[in-house]
Amino acid sequence: LQEKIEEIAAKYKHLVVKKCCYDGVRINHDETCEQRAARISVGPRCVKAFTECCVVASQLRANNSHKDLQLGR
């Protein structure tokens, strides 16, 4: 997960945009990525970075938990 997110974040050379990506990675079981992104007011660049990283992180976590289930963990 960390490697993949670092790969995505490396594209963003504006520090705030990069940090928007990292914010998207934070675990939040109560809201979807879209719901969380809707509260962002600093600009579309932040929304895009947040959403991309949030979705990727959610997918990777889902895949990992699915693998854990298959392995009977």
Epitope: K11, K13, H14, L15, V16, V17, K19, S41, V42, G43, P44, R45, C46
Partner: antibody, heavy 118, light 111 residues
Framework: QVQLVQSGAEVKKPGSSVKVSCKAS????????IHWMRQAPGQGLEWMGY????????NYNENFKGRVTITADKSTSTAYMELSSLRSEDTAVYYC???????????WGQGTTVTVSS | DIVLTQSPASLAVSPGQRATITCKAS??????????MNWYQQKPGQPPKLLIY???NLDSGVPARFSGSGSGTDFTLTINPVEAEDTANYYC?????????FGGGTKVEIK
């Protein structure tokens, strides 16, 4: 209407520090990044750094080698730029500006003249 | 850092003529179809004023005689026709990445 109002002119001795303020009004202060630029007499614009007041995130121009510190007071909607170890080459007009959509500077302060002289 | 090189450093134009200023970036300032190049006008004793953002979008209240174009590393600001009040310094600026950088400026004088 959006306004950025800066503090008044300063005259400083070499080696001292200066702290310039930039009071924002007419918009939600925490929604936009505040940048600081400077312009030496007869010269172009030099970017110094910025702060995102909502999170306190900052980034600085490495040319200033740790001499610059940018802070923000959300309670008063004011951003500050402090420059230390002043030298004569720091004599310039210092500007704050609001960055809209992480793309462009749509509003600027009126500028603060800082003169460094012994 | 992205270095922005403006040319010419100065130019004198007669009223009614066209003024063209170019800005060349040391690397592309485009990202996923968006251009992060902006232009500002600065008159003596005043702060810079936004003219054009994202290469070609006029800020509100800016006269239509100002226009911007370009992509990648090469950008142009055009004033056509030039008016006496356009005497000023003009700066390009990129916001794609930190550090934000400005061109060295172009001084436009009206003959």
């Amino acid at each position: 209407q959006v306004q950025l109002v800066q503090s008044g002119a300063e005259v400083k001795k070499p080696g001292s520090s200066v702290k310039v303020s930039c009071k924002a009004s007419g918009y939600t202060f925490t929604d936009h990044i505040i940048h600081w630029m400077r312009q030496a007499p007869g010269q172009g614009l030099e970017w110094m750094g910025y702060i995102y007041p909502r999170e306190g995130w900052t980034n600085y121009n490495e040319n200033f080698k740790g001499r610059v510190t940018i802070t923000a007071d959300k309670s008063t909607s004011t951003a500050y730029m402090e420059l230390s170890s002043l030298r004569s080459e720091d004599t310039a007009v210092y500007y704050c500006a609001r960055e809209r959509n992480l793309e462009y500077f749509d509003y600027w302060g009126q500028g603060t003249t800082v003169t460094v002289s012994s | 850092d992205i270095v922005l090189t403006q040319s010419p450093a100065s130019l004198a134009v007669s009223p009614g003529q066209r003024a063209t200023i170019t800005c060349k970036a040391s690397q592309s300032v485009d990202y996923e179809g968006d251009n992060y190049m902006n232009w500002y006008q600065q008159k003596p004793g005043q702060p810079p004023k936004l003219l054009i953002y994202a290469t070609s979008n006029l800020d509100s209240g800016v006269p239509a005689r100002f226009s911007g174009s370009g992509s990648g590393t090469d950008f142009t600001l055009t004033i056509n026709p030039v008016e006496a009040e356009d005497t000023a310094n003009y700066y390009c600026q990129q916001s794609l990445e930190d550090p934000h950088t400005f061109g060295g400026g172009t001084k436009v004088e009206i003959k």
